[in-house]
């Protein structure tokens, strides 16, 4: 970067090289060039010469002032006009950054995806900081009082093998960057309560010719969890509103769910599950499309036909045993 150049002087920023976005800043350039008394000192931002707000401080130093600096990153360098030199002489350069201190991390969530061997912890980091921000995830056993820390720049996967302090833990997240540090509230977890079953997948659909044609959706999961509650949502692709159907499921065999749908309409289906009575749901499965026939013939949609361009990390909770309209969209 610009900071690796050989300098014939010094460039510095006040209040600092990394500063809060929107601040007024001063960039100073001090020449130290043998037998060159600079006639002029020039500043460049991202290769473009600055024309205004430059003040000569003394024989070798000038200051460039910016009001309300809003660029997340800029490369600055300065040059000297040396007498009898035919081009400007480079003095020094520096990369500067502006951004925000981190918000308090909230919505700390830890889940264990079945078979993953990891506890995955995520959180809402808040507003974009624009600068390098690190997160330290603290995991403290409530049984042994032992605390482990994990450094990351986004979410963290913690091997369940490393969680040797029993089943109950406190988890909290510390966010830090050059402009500040914040800490989340503590989340209390029990490892048995945060397991999310292996993903449920819709494999195919068929519409069966009957007095009233019905569509059967085939779906399955590799979960070994016995008590699983699932939701399937569906809608015509032209609709905004989802219909949601709930199931208490035993995945010892492929599930078949029946729907009475309008003919000659393209529908989309998604499914998700949770361990019955627990807190966390799977994300919604990939979108599965099925078009009902105009009339009688049997139509089958195969799994390989479904679109996977949106897996939609969504949650909807409704009362068991009801067919519900869900127009809440994707909420966690």
């Amino acid at each position: 970067g610009i900071t690796n150049i050989n300098c014939s002087g010094h460039i510095w920023v006040e209040p600092a090289t990394i500063f809060k976005m929107g601040m007024n800043i001063s960039i100073y350039c001090q020449a130290a060039i043998k037998n060159c008394q600079p006639r002029k000192l020039h500043f460049y931002k991202n290769g473009i010469k600055e024309r205004f707000q430059i003040t000569r401080i003394n024989k070798t130093t000038a200051r460039l002032w910016y009001k309300n600096f809003l660029e997340p990153h800029a490369s600055m360098y300065c040059t000297a006009e040396c007498p009898k030199h035919f081009q400007e002489t480079l003095i020094c350069g520096k990369d500067i950054s502006s951004g925000y201190p981190p918000d308090i991390p909230d919505e700390v969530t830890c889940v264990i995806y079945e078979y993953s061997g990891n506890m995955t912890c995520t959180w809402n980091a808040g507003k974009l900081t624009y600068i390098d921000t690190k997160y330290v995830v603290h995991v403290k056993s409530l049984e042994t009082e032992e605390e482990q820390q994990y450094l990351t720049s986004s979410y963290i996967n913690i091997s369940t093998d490393s969680l040797q302090g029993g089943k109950k833990y406190l988890v909290w997240v510390q966010a830090a960057n050059a402009l500040g540090m914040e800490e989340s509230k503590q989340l209390q977890i029990h490892l048995d309560d945060i397991v999310i079953p292996s993903a449920a997948v819709i494999s195919r659909a068929e519409t069966i010719n009957a007095t009233v044609p019905k569509t059967i959706i085939y779906w399955d999961s590799q979960t070994t969890i016995e008590k699983v509650s699932c939701e399937m949502r569906y809608k015509a692709t032209t609709n905004q509103t989802w219909n949601v159907k709930e199931f208490d499921t035993n995945f010892t065999y492929v599930q078949q769910s029946e729907f009475y749908l309008e003919p000659n309409i393209k529908y989309v289906f998604q499914v998700r599950c949770q361990e019955t009575g627990k807190r966390y749901w799977q994300p919604w499965s990939s979108l599965f499309f099925h078009k009902t026939p105009e009339t009688v013939p049997q139509v089958t949609s195969k799994a390989f036909q479904h679109d996977t361009w949106n897996s939609g990390l969504t949650v909807a909770s409704i009362s068991t045993g009801h067919l519900t309209s869900d127009n809440r969209g994707d909420i966690g």
């Epitope: 130290a32 037998n35 008394q37 002029k40 000569r56 003394n58 024989k59 007498p83 009898k84 030199h85």
Partner: antibody, heavy 117, light 107 residues
């Protein structure tokens, strides 16, 4: 184009002080490195001191250290050289000159300082 | 301090002659050397800077060469107005120092 005009001739008694001025135009003093050179009548040129832009400070020749002070008034673009505790051997023409690319490019017309009892 | 020596100390030459003045530094000064011409009662005037660069407005019959410790000023085709004393000056390190001068007069 830079121009340099120095103050007029001075006659001083031994032990006295002299302050020679050097007014620049065409550029501001903040853009220039001023040096002072003297020449004893019939002798060569002798560098007394000047501004070192590499280190951002005024450097004095060892011979004049503690006896000479070089100052600047940026509001009037005037440089000054004050020499204290004058001796007869300080009788000389004193020049201010502007450093360019290692040379002293633009010189004042010189100020004759005569030290005589 | 860096000592500067010049030779010859004086030279008499005719108009049209080629005159060479040498300057030696007591230690290496790269190309940080300038040459000046001074006429009686006047301030010195720079002819050459950084050993070989001709100062703007100076006739091309003046040229400089050298690097390190040994330097040369050459006047190829001396003119009547070229009489005076010539000084070299090092600017490699402080204190700046001048050579003792070479006096050139016209035969």
């Amino acid at each position: 184009q830079v121009q340099v005009v120095q103050s007029g001739a001075e006659v001083k008694k031994p032990g006295a002080s002299v302050k020679v001025s050097c007014k620049v135009s065409g550029y501001t003093l903040i853009e220039l490195a001023i040096h002072w050179v003297r020449q004893v009548p019939g002798k060569g040129l002798e560098w007394m001191g000047g501004f070192d832009p590499e280190h951002g400070e005024t450097i004095y020749a060892q011979k004049f250290q503690g006896r000479v002070t070089m100052t600047e008034d940026t509001s009037t673009d005037t440089a000054y050289m004050e020499l204290n505790n004058l001796r007869s051997e300080d009788t000389a023409v004193y020049y201010c000159a502007i450093l360019e690319a290692g040379d002293l490019d633009c010189w004042g017309q010189g100020t004759l300082v005569t030290v005589s009892s | 301090d860096i000592q500067m020596t010049q030779s010859p100390s004086s030279v008499s030459a005719s108009v049209g002659d080629r005159v060479t003045i040498t300057c030696r530094a007591s230690q290496g000064i790269s190309n940080w050397l300038a040459w000046y011409q001074q006429k009686p009662g006047k301030a010195p005037k720079v002819l050459i800077y950084t050993a070989s660069s001709l100062q703007s407005g100076v006739p091309s019959r003046f040229s400089g060469s050298g690097s390190g410790t040994d330097f040369t000023l050459t006047v190829s085709g001396l003119q009547p107005e070229d009489f005076g004393t010539y000084y070299c000056q090092q600017a490699n390190s402080f204190p700046f120092t001048f050579g003792p001068g070479t006096k050139v007069d016209i035969k």
